[in-house]
């Protein structure tokens, strides 16, 4: 349906508070270098041209379309050439090419100071101050530092920010309160982030018909009592509203996710029997609700996929004449009998069994030739099965840090050319799976892991492709998304890597180690683990653990030490020399 | 040496009919998909439709109802018969074989040396 | 309704130039399903390459595809004189009845 003005029916559907921060986020998003004070200038900018646009539709500009209005916004940005450089060539561009360009200049790794958490009294003293003002700030310094993350939900996060600071700033002991809610908020944050990451690198890498796929699978999963008609229905919903969102259209997407969720909420019974207390929530609370509804039950007595997708004389018809839906019903089918598979093992499944038909059809005996499709699933299906275990009993005997430790060396020797930083923070990523998925019954670990893992080996992929160094990681990347994790598993030491000129700078660790939180001081360790496998990429895992107790010991010692910089300064050197020594 | 050789073509009046063949030889036929693709005179190529091994067929839409491909393997042979011909069917006809390991795929790595029809009164 | 776009539709060209041509498909092709083709006047078409970048045996490798989704490039690193002829594309799609062939681009000498 058409409107005269879109920049009016978006702040008419949203309301104001949405507009403006759906507007912030936006500009953020784009704009991820510019001062707070300069975005609230734009937003109220917008704001107030957009309330003119509400009064009259047909006054001068309010035909525009959104792209043309923000982009012309940004494009008054007087620093833009000299803070961003070529993204100002962007506004040389006429749109829809305008709007390509900002999005191709968004930096998923900017070069920004890490967030550092005030005083309990002092954030409380600025919330009472001005809860506007702090509660923007939230938003642009989350939308600056995440520019894919899912605008709707940043939204939802911010009320809970909100909340917590209203709830907390009144209590008695305010740190107590405040610091655990702003910690789960935090790492909630930054797992949505990734998450969403995933599913703009799905559309915008691979196109719509990866990101559908892989809706219909886990659709299917959650709502396995819905029919195919209706998981369609909802893909095609949520598609249209990712689309909108990993595309910068940041109002139509929070537009379209609300009219999502009230579909939802009015076709409960045709969905699934869980919605039912996420319907009774407010709006940004019942969306995201609903995104993250549990599995439902799976219906009772589901007959065998056999009779359908081997035995049926139709199976190659049916291929042949309508691919998407055929393969589309097979992976609804396969996806909701299969709560305990991965989304992207039912993917791979769903591939295995196109391959087969695709190779079969055309045959003398197609029957003959695809009769045992079923059975190549199976190596298929162990293979994440036995993954999920030798990682979760890896991850049981070493704990936490020295799980991380050993996926450190594993990838390191993988792909010794990606830089230590990225390594660092992959790595430690990797090895949260551990906490995260390994408690889980078993019916639950391998979903929990592998999309876990997809998630984490995508923001390898976003930062490798903005400094590419490694052609073993380009092509895991880009040849096929569902194989990306059985792609990286499958990388062994890298042969052909020269390795790294020992350089005791790199080695050298001063009294500021001491005064680090525990987290600091594993990051700083793994840094130097790291380096020391892209020295000794073929060091063994006795060496390399010998080498981290003495770094550990060497701190330890020098941290109680009376003079701790002396320490450092003497023992420096003893330790890379006997870890030189340890490596020869 | 596989070969595919058409044969069948010439001149027919606006709403006549023709059958044309495709004699396959080097390789057992009944292994194999088989596609008729036409190309008018300085035109784009135009896929017709195909035969799999088992005998199912699949057309275009637009050739759908008049173009019928049949198979008969104990001749290595494939036939395209056509109906209701129009001046707008004039073209060169060609057999084509789909790459092995395909079925829907656009990958015809065979070819004969192509028919002309041409429909004019 | 589907459609395939080859550009330019035609291109004059010395011996060992480059040549890049491509080709829109609306909507995207079924799983990189898609192949092009060399024909030379008077000759049957060639098939060249397949799933958008795998090379047929004995195609010298100076030609390579590329692409994904709906936009597709045929290049011609260098080109020889036995290169001269038409180029096309060939798309399938969801349905196999949908398979479609682009128009053609005629590479012809400078």
């Known amino acids: 349906d058409t409107h005269k003005s879109e920049v009016a029916h978006r702040f008419k559907d949203l309301g104001e508070e949405h507009f403006k921060g759906l507007v912030l986020v936006a500009f953020s998003q784009y704009l991820q270098q510019c001062p707070f004070e300069e975005h609230v200038k734009l937003v109220n900018e917008v704001t107030e041209f957009a309330k003119t646009c509400v009064a009259d539709e047909s006054a001068e500009n309010c035909d525009k379309s959104l792209h043309t209005l923000f982009g012309d916004k940004l494009c008054t940005v007087a620093t833009l050439r000299e803070t961003y450089g070529e993204m100002a060539d962007c506004c040389a561009k006429q749109e829809p090419e305008r709007n390509e360009c900002f999005l191709q200049h968004k930096d998923d790794n900017p070069n920004l100071p890490p967030l550092v958490r005030p005083e309990v009294d002092v954030m409380c003293t600025a919330f009472h101050d001005n809860e506007a003002t702090f509660l923007k700030k939230y938003l642009y310094e989350v939308a600056r530092r995440h520019p894919y993350f899912y605008a709707p939900e940043l939204l939802f996060f911010a009320a809970r920010y909100k909340a917590a600071f209203a709830e907390c700033c009144q209590a008695a002991d305010k740190a107590a309160c405040l610091l655990p809610k702003l910690d789960e908020l935090r790492d909630e944050g930054k797992a949505s982030s990734a998450k969403q990451r995933l599913k703009c690198a799905s559309l915008q890498k691979f196109g719509d018909r990866a990101f559908k796929a892989w809706a219909v699978a886990r659709l299917s999963q959650k709502f396995p009592k819905a029919e195919f008609a209706e998981v369609s229905k909802l893909v095609t919903d949520l598609t249209k509203v990712h689309t909108e969102c990993c595309h910068g259209d940041l109002l139509e997407c929070a537009d379209d996710r609300a009219d999502l969720a009230k579909y939802m909420c009015e076709n409960q019974d045709s969905i699934s029997s869980k919605l039912k207390e996420c319907c009774d929530k407010p709006l940004l609370e019942k969306s995201h609700c609903l995104a993250e509804v549990e599995n439902d039950e799976m219906p009772a007595d589901l007959p065998s996929l056999a009779a359908d997708y081997v035995e049926s004389k139709d199976v190659c018809k049916n291929y042949a004449e309508a691919k998407d839906v055929f393969l589309g019903m097979f992976l609804y089918e396969y996806a909701r009998r299969h709560p305990d598979y991965s989304v992207m093992l039912l993917l791979r499944l769903a591939k295995a069994y196109e391959a087969t038909l695709e190779k079969c059809c055309a045959a003398a005996d197609p029957h003959e030739c695809y009769a045992k499709v079923f059975d190549e699933f199976q190596p298929l299906v162990e293979e994440p099965q036995n993954l999920v275990k030798q990682n979760c009993e890896l991850f049981e005997q070493l704990g936490e840090y020295k799980f991380q430790n050993a996926l450190l060396v594993r990838y390191t020797k993988k792909v010794p050319q990606v830089s230590t930083p990225t390594l660092v923070e992959v790595s430690r990523n990797l090895g949260k799976v551990g906490a995260k998925c390994c408690k889980l019954p078993e019916a639950k670990r391998m979903p929990c892991a592998e999309d876990y893992l997809s998630v984490v080996l995508n923001r390898l992929c976003v930062l490798h492709e903005k400094t590419p160094v490694s052609e073993k990681v380009t092509k895991c990347c880009t040849e096929s998304l569902v194989n990306r994790r059985p792609c990286f598993s499958a990388l062994e030491l890298d042969e052909a890597y020269v390795p790294k000129a020992f350089n005791a700078e790199t080695f050298t660790f001063h009294a500021d180690m001491c005064t680090l939180s525990e987290k600091e001081k594993q990051v700083k360790k793994q840094t130097a683990l790291v380096e020391l496998v892209k020295h000794k990429p073929k060091a063994t895992k006795e060496q390399l653990k010998g080498v981290m107790d003495n770094f550990a010991a060497f701190v330890e010692k020098c941290c109680k030490a009376d003079d701790k910089e002396a320490c450092f300064a003497e023992e420096g050197p003893k330790f890379v020399a006997a870890s030189q020594a340890a490596l020869a | 040496e596989v070969q595919l050789l058409e044969s069948g073509g010439g001149l027919v009046q606006p709403g006549g009919s023709l059958r044309l063949s495709c004699a396959v030889s080097g390789i057992d036929l009944s292994n194999y998909a088989i596609n008729w693709v036409r190309q008018a005179p300085g035109k784009c190529l135009e896929w017709i439709g195909i035969i799999w091994a088992s005998g199912t067929t699949f057309y275009a839409t637009w050739a759908k109802g008049r173009f019928t491909i049949s198979r008969d393997n104990s001749k290595n042979t494939v036939y395209l018969q056509m109906n209701s011909l129009r001046a707008e069917d004039t073209a060169v006809y060609y057999c084509?074989?789909?790459?092995?390991?395909?079925?829907?795929?656009?990958?015809?790595?065979?070819w004969g040396q192509g028919t002309l029809v041409t429909v004019s009164s | 309704d589907i459609q395939m776009t080859q550009s330019p539709s035609s291109v004059s060209a010395s011996v060992g130039d480059r040549v890049t041509i491509t080709c829109q498909s609306s909507?995207?092709?079924?799983?990189?399903?898609l192949s092009w083709y060399q024909q030379k006047p008077g000759k049957a078409p060639k098939l060249l390459i397949y799933e958008a970048s795998k090379l047929t045996s004995g195609v010298p490798s100076r030609f390579s595809g590329s692409g994904s989704g709906t936009d597709f490039t045929l290049t011609i690193s260098s080109l020889q004189p036995e290169d001269f002829a038409t180029y096309y594309c060939g798309g399938g799609y969801s349905s196999i009845s949908d398979t479609t062939f682009g128009c053609g681009t005629k590479v012809e000498i400078k």
């Open positions: 909507p995207s092709v079924w799983s990189n399903f």
């Open positions: 084509a074989r789909t790459v092995p390991g395909y079925s829907t795929a656009p990958y015809f790595d065979l």
